[in-house]
């Protein structure tokens, strides 16, 4: 099914990941395909194998190495290319050359704590993941918090634009119950986007003290 | 925005050759993956070749694999298809087509958002 519509993104993580989705509609979910990374000015390849995540479009992480390393850099390009197997052979269904800086998708913040909890207000801390020394403090930052009776796409972005590992959370209600996501974004790269949302911090106010005026 | 225009169509013998060349305008060429498509009368637009930005990467339909070669020369704003031992099923007008910057190249026609107006090659028998 080649002339159903097919597309083919990757980001790189800034380290020593490339991600890669390939979705083509009317295409067999058994169809066996895979990414092959080939560096303009690096010794090795990768591959990795295309595994469904829905109906029509399959993923796979290309694992350059240790999750710290600094395997590629600015002006590094990655030939990708997408092969599905047809009979004995591979077909070449996509062609990509990659730039990994103007292409970025960090990983998401980790190590979300609360560092100082009150009645009305809430300091959180969190930390990147695998992020690039290249890119010193130049790095943003997208907050929300999730207010009782309220979904995330409702919740209001808070935004940080410099490389700030913290928040304050100002103006919330006494003794409630709250949920906090955070993600980044490199300020380089013509097609870099924001990291996926932390996993969700929850939290709770303290109290309001008897008989004061809160 | 890329601007495309083919030429070098023709009426050529079975089994000749022809090459046609794509003429791009715009800054961004040199950053964008091409394509050539054909459409034999009757039929669908159909993939034929890709070439990625620098050239290093390269894919083709089955049915011209081993006869056409795509190229490209980007000083030039310069996309090529060579097409060798050519058969009357490779009749058609030829397409160039430019991915958005920043895409892939892929064998549907839905992948590239900017073509030319094409040019006719006729193989006869």
């Known amino acids: 099914a080649v002339n159903g519509t097919s597309q083919f993104t990757c980001f790189y993580n800034s380290r020593a990941n490339i991600s890669c989705v390939w979705s083509q509609d009317g295409a067999l979910q058994d169809t066996s395909c895979q990414v092959h990374a080939w560096p303009d000015r690096r010794r090795w390849n990768q591959t990795c194998e295309l595994l469904p995540v829905s109906q029509a479009s399959w993923a796979c992480n290309l694992i350059l190495g240790a999750p710290d390393s600094q395997k590629l850099t600015t002006v590094d390009i990655v030939t990708l290319r997408v092969l599905c197997r047809e009979g004995v052979r591979w077909r070449v269904m996509a062609i990509q050359d990659f730039k990994p800086f103007e292409n970025l998708r960090l990983m998401a913040p980790i190590s979300l704590q609360v560092v100082h909890v009150e009645t009305h207000r809430c300091n959180i801390s969190w930390e990147i993941s695998q992020a690039s020394h290249y890119f010193e403090r130049h790095l943003e930052f997208e907050a929300r918090t999730l207010s009782p009776g309220h979904t995330w796409e409702e919740a209001p972005l808070l935004t940080l634009k410099q490389k700030q590992e913290w928040i304050c959370l100002e103006t919330l209600t006494p003794d409630t119950q709250y949920e906090f996501q955070v993600r980044v974004k490199p300020l380089q790269g013509e097609f870099t986007t924001w990291s996926p949302w932390s996993q969700p911090l929850a939290f709770r106010t303290k109290p309001a003290a008897l008989g004061k005026d809160t | 925005e890329v601007q495309l225009v083919e030429s070098g169509g023709g009426l050529v013998q079975a089994g000749g050759s022809l090459r046609l060349s794509c003429a791009a305008s715009?800054?961004?060429?040199?950053?964008?993956?091409m394509g050539w498509f054909r459409q034999a009368p009757g039929k669908e637009r159909e993939f034929v070749a890709a070439?990625?930005?620098?050239?290093?990467?390269?894919m083709y339909a089955e049915s011209v694999e081993g006869r056409f070669t795509i190229s490209r020369e980007n000083a030039k704003n310069m996309v090529y298809l060579q097409m060798n031992s050519l058969k009357p099923e490779d009749t058609a007008i030829y397409y160039c087509?430019?991915?958005?910057?920043?895409?892939?190249?892929?064998?549907?026609?839905?992948?590239?958002?900017?073509w030319g107006q094409g040019t006719q090659v006729t193989v006869s028998s």
């Open positions: 087509a430019a991915a958005r910057r920043g895409r892939a190249a892929v064998r549907s026609e839905g992948g590239y958002d900017f």
């Open positions: 715009g800054r961004t060429f040199s950053t964008t993956e």
């Open positions: 070439i990625t930005w620098t050239g290093r990467g390269t």
